[in-house]
Interface confidence: low
């Protein structure tokens, strides 16, 4: 009788034991669960940081080679460019990199969807019509919403095999391009329209680059 | 095996128009662009433009701007050139040609058609 | 437009012997992405062209290996290291790096 008492106490600490092991299992899930979101938010966050780079040293460029630029003296224009610079310099400062973690499938399919990218770049950059037809294709494949044109289902399967976060970052990478067209589109227009060696020399170096 | 076929030979009068055809076979119509070619007569080859079969887009040599117009019809995995307002020294031989790949490098000029003579005479 | 300048003009040559063309850009063939876009072609007599070296010293596919490019940034060289009979007509250079693509004049290897 007394064994079976002993027995039951033993018994009735391991169950004691093993809820309690339960509990602890359960709060450092939950405090992994919080981490988790915390870790999420802080690549969220790296990755807005890293695209805010990306938009002021776009928007510092564009204003470096605005129309506006062109319209002043050489003193204000060096002023202008000497600030540019300066906060060019100081967003280059900042570096942030968000890895994103890769089977080789999807590390195959983001070299391939870069590489058409890079292809379209290369081979229009004096030929901005063309290139934004191109662009606007694969941009198509990218976007969620009604398309515009044409989609191009080549290069949708591509990106449909990259991961996620490169997905994100390829539909980024087209909309600064597409942008930096109209921006040149516009200052080409302009262009046109204003006679005088400037505009001839611009013409001379945007025909230089076909490949 | 990759093959651009290209029209007849064609006699024009001054002032008329020509339209050279060029079927492509043996690849993917759309992967790759189109380049047109003349050589005159004792001269050097001659760009002429491309167009990109996937959208339709092109580029023309300054020098034919206007006069040229290249095209594709994609259903016939063909590709054509017209040029206008024909003059005596546009008499030469036409080539299409296979031009870069749209996914990736490569390309360029690695496929002929076998030419198309157009004299232009009155 | 880029001007491409081909030498010699005409090349006899004697059948087992290496040949040499030289071609010369009016400027740089280096793409801002640093590639070269420089490409030689044949053309046997009464044929269309054909690409033998694409971007500098490539071999485009079935080409034999005695053909062989070199060269870099304006200067660039074609060479046969042994030729054959089937290797006359007419060689150019060509370059795409710069719009319009521009074609050099043409060299024409013959058979002494």
């Known amino acids: 009788m007394a064994q079976a008492k002993i027995n039951a106490k033993a018994n009735e600490g391991r169950f004691c034991r093993s809820s309690s092991m339960a509990d602890r299992s359960s709060r450092l899930l939950e405090s992994l669960d919080q981490l988790e979101l915390r870790v999420e938010a802080l690549r969220e966050a790296a990755t807005a940081v890293e695209q805010e780079k990306e938009i002021l040293l776009e928007m510092i460029h564009s204003i470096q080679n605005s129309q506006d630029m062109r319209q002043i003296s050489d003193g204000e224009r060096e002023e202008l460019n000497l600030t540019a610079n300066r906060l060019m310099g100081r967003t280059l400062t900042v570096e942030v990199s968000v890895e994103t973690i890769r089977n080789p499938q999807q590390q195959e399919s983001l070299k391939h969807a870069t590489r058409i990218i890079d292809e379209v770049v290369n081979k229009f950059l004096d030929d901005l019509g063309n290139a934004k037809s191109h662009l606007m294709s694969l941009y198509s494949a990218c976007s969620s919403e009604v398309p515009h044109g044409p989609v191009d289902q080549k290069f949708q399967s591509i990106v449909i095999g990259c991961a996620l976060e490169d997905q994100k970052k390829i539909k980024r990478r087209l909309e600064t391009l597409l942008r930096n067209i109209e921006n040149s589109d516009k200052a080409i227009k302009l262009l046109e329209h204003s006679k005088g060696a400037g505009s001839k020399t611009l013409q001379q170096n945007a025909e230089s680059r076909f490949n | 095996q990759v093959q651009l076929v290209q029209s007849g030979a064609e006699v024009k009068k001054p002032g008329a128009s020509v339209k050279v055809s060029c079927k492509a076979s043996?690849?993917?119509?759309?992967?790759?662009?189109f380049y047109w070619v003349r050589q005159a007569p004792g001269q050097r080859l001659e760009w002429i433009g491309y167009?990109?079969?996937?959208?339709?887009?092109?580029t023309y040599n300054r020098k034919f701007k206007g006069r040229v117009t290249i095209t594709v019809d994609k259903s016939a995995s063909t590709a054509y050139m017209e040029l206008s307002s024909l003059r005596s020294e546009d008499t030469a031989v036409y080539y299409c040609?296979?031009?870069?790949?749209?996914?990736?490098?490569?390309?360029?000029?690695?496929?002929w058609g076998q030419g198309t003579l157009v004299t232009v005479s009155s | 437009d880029v001007v491409m300048t081909q030498s010699p003009l005409s090349l006899p040559v004697t059948l087992g012997q290496p040949a040499s063309i030289s071609c010369r850009s009016s400027?740089?063939?280096?793409?801002?992405?640093?590639?070269?876009?420089l490409h030689w072609f044949q053309q046997r007599p009464g044929q269309s062209p054909r690409l033998l070296i694409h971007?500098?010293?490539n071999r485009f596919s079935g080409v034999p290996d005695r053909f062989s490019g070199s060269g870099s940034g304006t200067d660039f060289t074609l060479k046969i290291s042994r030729v054959e009979a089937e290797d006359v007509g007419v060689y150019y250079c060509?370059?795409?790096?710069?719009?319009?693509?521009?074609f050099g004049g043409g060299t024409k290897v013959e058979i002494k």
């Open positions: 971007k500098v010293s």
């Open positions: 040609a296979r031009g870069y790949y749209r996914y990736g490098g490569g390309g360029d000029f690695d496929y």
């Open positions: 167009i990109d079969p996937y959208n339709a887009g092109n």
């Open positions: 060509s370059q795409n790096t710069h719009i319009p693509p521009t």
């Open positions: 043996g690849y993917s119509f759309t992967d790759y662009t």
């Open positions: 400027q740089s063939l280096v793409h801002s992405n640093g590639n070269t876009y």
